[in-house]
């Protein structure tokens, strides 16, 4: 659970994060697992520890091995292990499987390829991107922040994509490359103005005071992968996060795909221990995409005791 595989190429920078995380103020000690020898924190060393990070600047094949990190909070010491493998540079263009990060898939509507592990490094834009070792050129390719966007994705855009960037440490520059496969989903998708499936507009829901109730906001946005599709609840026109009432919590949006192929998202508003004042609120289900915003309002009313008895 608290062991993590990391890999890199010789003569490149490699930065590894301790699998046990904690506050930045927690002391983190790093050791070579085999020898129990402490890893120095002085930056003049080629391999040194910097808080939760272990830095190889640059890495050598001989650095391969298991490293122990101990995160020392005021109350507990928690141990993690980083299993590091440094490989020799490949003479040819082929990137072996063991150097590949997780595969990502995209479609015509969503073609972002994130550069793996880049958030660990001190880098500056732009990134360089390569496909099957060829530098990417042309207006279809846009390097944006830490990802690559491909316009009008086609099936032959599938392949291995490598990002290359420079890590800067105290004025010294080190090269880093990372490769992942990109697959293309052949999807005849489309996007349209949001359609809210639930609740109905101006609906009223009967609730019992003191009971728990759930309100579901469900909307569909078209077919296939959507570039932007969001649903959320608002209370009296305010975001849930701005409404300081822990009894009322919104769940993360859940993606759904119905039998008709529609791309839909829903989110549940959970209201615990319903109170009288909850009946005075306006609950808005908001659905948003690039076409615009649709809003359905629902209110709560007290369940009629006569109905309850029947």
């Amino acid at each position: 659970k608290f062991s993590k595989q990391s890999w890199g190429l010789e003569n490149e920078a490699l930065i590894v994060r301790c699998p046990r995380q904690g506050k930045s103020s927690y002391i983190v000690d790093w050791y070579y697992s085999q020898t129990n020898k402490s890893i120095p924190t002085q930056e003049r060393n080629r391999v040194f520890a910097s808080g939760q990070l272990l830095k190889f600047l640059p890495a050598e094949v001989a650095d391969s091995g298991i490293y122990t990190c101990i995160v020392r909070s005021p109350t507990f010491n928690r141990t993690g292990y980083a299993n590091v493998t440094i490989y020799k540079k490949q003479p040819d263009c082929n990137v072996p499987d063991y150097l590949m990060y997780s595969t990502v898939s995209g479609s015509e509507k969503n073609s972002k390829i994130y550069c793996p592990t880049i958030d660990l490094y001190n880098w500056t834009a732009p990134l360089e991107w390569f496909k099957n070792c060829q530098a990417l050129q042309g207006s279809r390719y846009k390097a944006h922040k830490s990802f690559l966007v491909i316009d009008n994705v086609m099936t032959d855009d599938a392949g291995d994509y490598t990002c290359k960037f420079i890590h800067n440490e105290n004025g010294a520059n080190y090269s880093v490359t990372a490769t992942r496969s990109f697959t293309v989903k052949d999807e005849q998708g489309f996007s349209r103005f949001p359609v809210i499936r639930a609740p109905a507009h101006n609906e009223t829901k009967e609730v019992e005071i003191g009971e728990n109730t759930n309100l579901t906001c469900s909307a569909c946005f078209g077919k296939g992968a959507q570039f932007l599709a969001a649903v959320q609840w608002q209370l009296n026109g305010n975001k849930i996060t701005d409404f300081s009432e822990p009894r009322i919590q919104q769940e993360e949006g859940q993606n759904q795909s119905f039998s008709d192929g529609l791309a839909c998202v829903n989110t549940v508003l959970r209201i615990a221990d319903v109170k009288e004042e909850d009946l005075l609120l306006r609950y808005d289900c908001l659905a948003l995409n690039l076409h615009g915003l649709r809003r359905h309002t629902i209110r709560l009313s007290r369940k009629n005791p006569i109905d309850h008895q029947s």
């Epitope: 995380q21 506050k23 103020s25 909070s73 109350t75 507990f76």
Partner: antibody, heavy 121, light 107 residues
């Protein structure tokens, strides 16, 4: 949603022991520390100690060490605090509270409703 | 143990006023300070963590600042529902310790 449900009020004799429970729901019990806090009108809030439910490791405030014992049952997602050799000074409301140590917010973000303990002969 | 000295103990203010509570640590606690609100008959609620980060759902009239030994908690425009006791707490070193609390009353 996250909830910490504490056991009911206790009336105990001086010298006796009491065990309070705190049942967690709505999150992965082993991903957060469980802390216990004592509150009295005179002394305000006092940190008793904490348990890591994943490992069973504990840490105590020296003030309570030897008298407070924290345990956790992963199967029922319940944390317990036993307080022994009770005196009238132990009359207080006791809270269990969840503490995130791996990511923000680093703090006691959810609290139980509290258990009132009265020590009296 | 780190002693958290919180002042004032009591505050009597009018709705709309700006309120400032201070907490002084007996030694440096970096920015490992949280602020809690406890309304009458309720459990404490986390408002601010890491000295200045507002917890989810907390209105932006509540702010925190400070580093090292001196910390400040401010309510910019006090509302009637802010009637409560406010506590600071450090979790930089064990045992974790709380301030004595500030009781806020509305005129």
């Amino acid at each position: 949603q996250v909830q910490l449900q504490q056991s009911g009020a206790e009336l105990v004799r001086p010298g006796a022991s009491v065990t309070l429970s705190c049942k967690a729901s709505g999150y992965t019990f082993t991903d957060y520390e469980m802390h216990w806090v004592k509150q009295t009108p005179v002394h305000g809030l006092d940190w008793i100690g904490t348990i890591d439910p994943e490992t069973g490791d504990t840490a105590y405030n020296q003030k309570f060490k030897g008298r407070a014992t924290l345990t956790a049952d992963k199967s029922s997602s319940t944390a317990y605090m036993e307080l022994s050799s009770l005196t009238s000074e132990d009359s207080a409301v006791y809270y269990c509270t969840r503490y995130s140590y791996t990511n923000s917010p680093y703090g006691m973000d959810y609290w139980g409703q509290g258990t009132s303990v009265t020590v009296s002969s | 143990d780190v002693v958290m000295t919180q002042t004032p103990k009591f505050l009597l203010v009018s709705a709309g006023d700006r309120v400032t509570i201070t907490c002084k640590a007996s030694q440096s606690v970096s920015n490992d300070v949280a602020w809690y609100q406890q309304k009458p008959g309720q459990s404490p609620k986390l408002l601010i963590y890491y000295a200045s980060n507002r917890y989810t759902g907390v209105p932006d009239r509540f702010t925190g600042s400070g580093y090292g030994t001196d910390f400040t908690f401010t309510i910019n425009t006090v509302q009637a529902e802010d009637l409560a006791v406010y506590f600071c707490q450090q979790d930089y070193s064990s045992p974790y310790t709380f301030g004595g609390g500030t009781k806020l009353e509305i005129k």
